[in-house]
């Protein structure tokens, strides 16, 4: 990563260093240390103070984005004296060269697409590269298949999501022969970026007085169980006047997903379609294919 680290320190330095791959800030251990503290301040003056590691000469920042530039700070007291040191972590490179409009979505339960746009001041020969690290930081995933626009990487397709965890760190680096390119980074929750498939196996069975709709919950990337789903049924009478309200029915997920409603014979032709969402986010899937029941002469 092309980022300059500039140290602001008194004469006897702690030699503070930051490894952006592990998000670990470390410094030279001092004898007879009585107190240590590390923190960062971002451009909006928000302060993040992680727990110190066991050896007390390093700390790891779990969930931070660095592209706006941050300042790290370490305070150490020993029985003899106090130390303080700042480390500036700017996003070096020309302003406006970083990838922008970055977004990702998971679909079909095991595929993910990420897309971005070239920075407005990025030179013609800019090339972007995507790296993903899971929250356990055990693995770095490099984009296996880039989506290109005139030779520039503007997206990434992943068909193996096994390295992801529930929260992941995305980094888009840039290179150019002409100038330094800024990086862009982002933290994304898999549950917030997944687009569900519609429910499957939708069936309708009617008797003389009622119709029973059954369906199966969609397969998802996240490990969800039945209570995590909310469904919406659109029961629609065919050949009605334009502007007639469809009946939208909300149904909570259950071990057996079913909805029973009164509909007596002879019944007009109806259609039913269903969509699914995470009950806490209500990010609706597309509708399932409409299933028809009833008769034209009902």
């Amino acid at each position: 990563e092309k980022s300059d680290l500039r140290t602001v320190a008194p004469a006897s330095s702690l030699n503070v260093r930051f490894d952006s791959r592990t998000m670990n800030l470390s410094w030279d251990c001092q004898e007879n240390t009585t107190f240590s503290k590390c923190f960062l301040t971002d451009k909006k003056n928000r302060v993040v103070e992680p727990r110190l590691s066991n050896n007390e000469c390093s700390c790891t920042f779990r969930e931070i984005c660095l592209h706006e530039g941050v300042t790290f700070e370490v305070h150490v007291n020993t029985s003899q004296r106090g130390f303080q040191q700042k480390l500036l972590y700017p996003n070096s490179g020309r302003e406006g060269t970083a990838a922008q409009n970055f977004s990702c979505f998971i679909y079909n339960a095991d595929l993910m697409n990420c897309t971005w746009a070239r920075g407005p001041t990025a030179p013609r020969d800019v090339q972007y590269f995507l790296y993903i690290r899971n929250s356990k930081r055990r693995r770095e995933i490099r984009c296996p298949y880039y989506i290109q626009d005139s030779g520039t990487h503007v997206g990434c397709h992943l068909d193996n999501l096994s390295g992801l965890t529930s929260r992941n760190y995305f980094l888009v680096n840039g290179t150019s022969r002409e100038i330094g390119i800024q990086f862009f980074d982002s933290l994304l929750d898999t549950k917030k970026i997944e687009r569900f498939n519609p429910p499957s196996n939708v069936t309708v069975r009617c008797n003389t007085t009622h119709c029973l709709v059954r369906w199966k919950q969609p397969r998802t990337y996240q490990k969800l169980s039945y209570l995590d789903f909310q469904y919406q049924l659109d029961v629609h009478r065919k050949n009605t006047q334009p502007g007639t309200e469809n009946l939208l029915i909300n149904v909570s997920g259950d071990l057996e997903n079913r909805y029973n409603f009164p509909s007596s014979e002879p019944r007009a032709k109806h259609s039913v379609k269903i969509r699914a969402a995470d009950v806490r986010i209500l990010n609706w899937s597309s509708w399932s294919e409409a299933i028809e029941f009833g008769s034209d002469d009902g």
Epitope: T165, K223, S225, Y226, L227, D228, E256, R280
Partner: antibody
Framework: QVQLVQSGAEVKKPGASVKVSCKIS????????IHWVRQTPTKGFEWMGG????????VYAQRFQGRVTMTEDTSIDTAYLTLSSLRSDDTAVYYC?????????????WGKGTMVTVSS | QAVLTQPSSVSGAPGQRVTISCTGS?????????VSWYQQLPGTAPKLLIY???KRPSGVPDRFSASKSGTSASLAITGLQADDEADYYC???????????FGGGTKLTVL
């Protein structure tokens, strides 16, 4: 109608093992996650373990580690709990349950329970 | 010793409203993790009453509602009925641990 049918009450001597079964009807076990919880008058409910999708394996509560084993036979839709080196304070009602949500763990449907008495 | 603290008993007359509190800490309810509530009628298995803080599974009447704020949660029962007499338990998870942690339970008596 989904149901969890548990095996009958057991009386065991200290140091012995007990195996409790939990048969699922009305649904395929392979599509479900089963967790086990026990209840005593003194300690109340204690979660024992179950399938954790993040780890993709069965995880056990620390306090039962080494003494508890949870297995499944999906061909007969039955889950099993084995607890070994029984002590008198293992006397409890043992419940199997179906996970309704993983985040956080929510137990959606419970079996009727199996009373295990440990007494010399 | 239960991780979540509940009153040992509450009571109310038929038709009344009662609430049951559940107090945790910053490493469970306040972490923040969602809270579930279970009802255990005498001599029976627990039944899920509320999940994700305030959602009811199908079949649970809307007389039961719940809320969560900070490190505590509460269950409210309106229009109290004789067959609501039961033990009620709250549950959530503890940061860094797998599985559920439970409250000690509250016995509801309908006078």
């Amino acid at each position: 109608q989904v149901q969890l049918v548990q095996s009958g009450a057991e009386v065991k001597k200290p140091g012995a093992s007990v195996k409790v079964s939990c048969k699922i009807s009305g649904h395929s076990l392979s599509e479900l996650s089963i967790h086990w919880v026990r209840q005593t008058p003194t300690k109340g409910f204690e979660w024992m373990g179950g399938f954790d999708p993040e780890e993709n394996e069965i995880v056990y509560a620390q306090r039962f580690q080494g003494r508890v084993t949870m297995t499944e036979d999906t061909s007969i839709d039955t889950a099993y709990l084995t607890l070994s080196s029984l002590r008198s304070d293992d006397t409890a009602v043992y419940y199997c349950s179906i996970v309704g949500s993983f985040s956080p763990l929510t137990l959606g449907l419970w079996g009727k329970g199996t009373m295990v008495t440990v007494s010399s | 010793q239960a991780v979540l603290t509940q009153p040992s008993s509450v009571s109310g007359a038929p038709g009344q409203r009662v609430t049951i509190s559940c107090t945790g800490s910053g490493s469970n309810i306040g972490a923040p993790y969602d809270v579930s509530w279970y009802q255990q009628l005498p001599g029976t298995a627990p039944k899920l009453l509320i999940y994700h803080n305030n959602k009811r599974p199908s079949g649970v009447p809307d007389r039961f509602s719940a809320s969560k704020s900070g490190t505590s949660a509460s269950l409210a029962i309106t229009g109290l009925q004789a067959d609501d007499e039961a033990d009620y338990y709250c549950a959530t998870v503890e940061a860094g641990l797998s599985g559920s942690v439970f409250g000690g339970g509250t016995k509801l008596t309908v006078l």
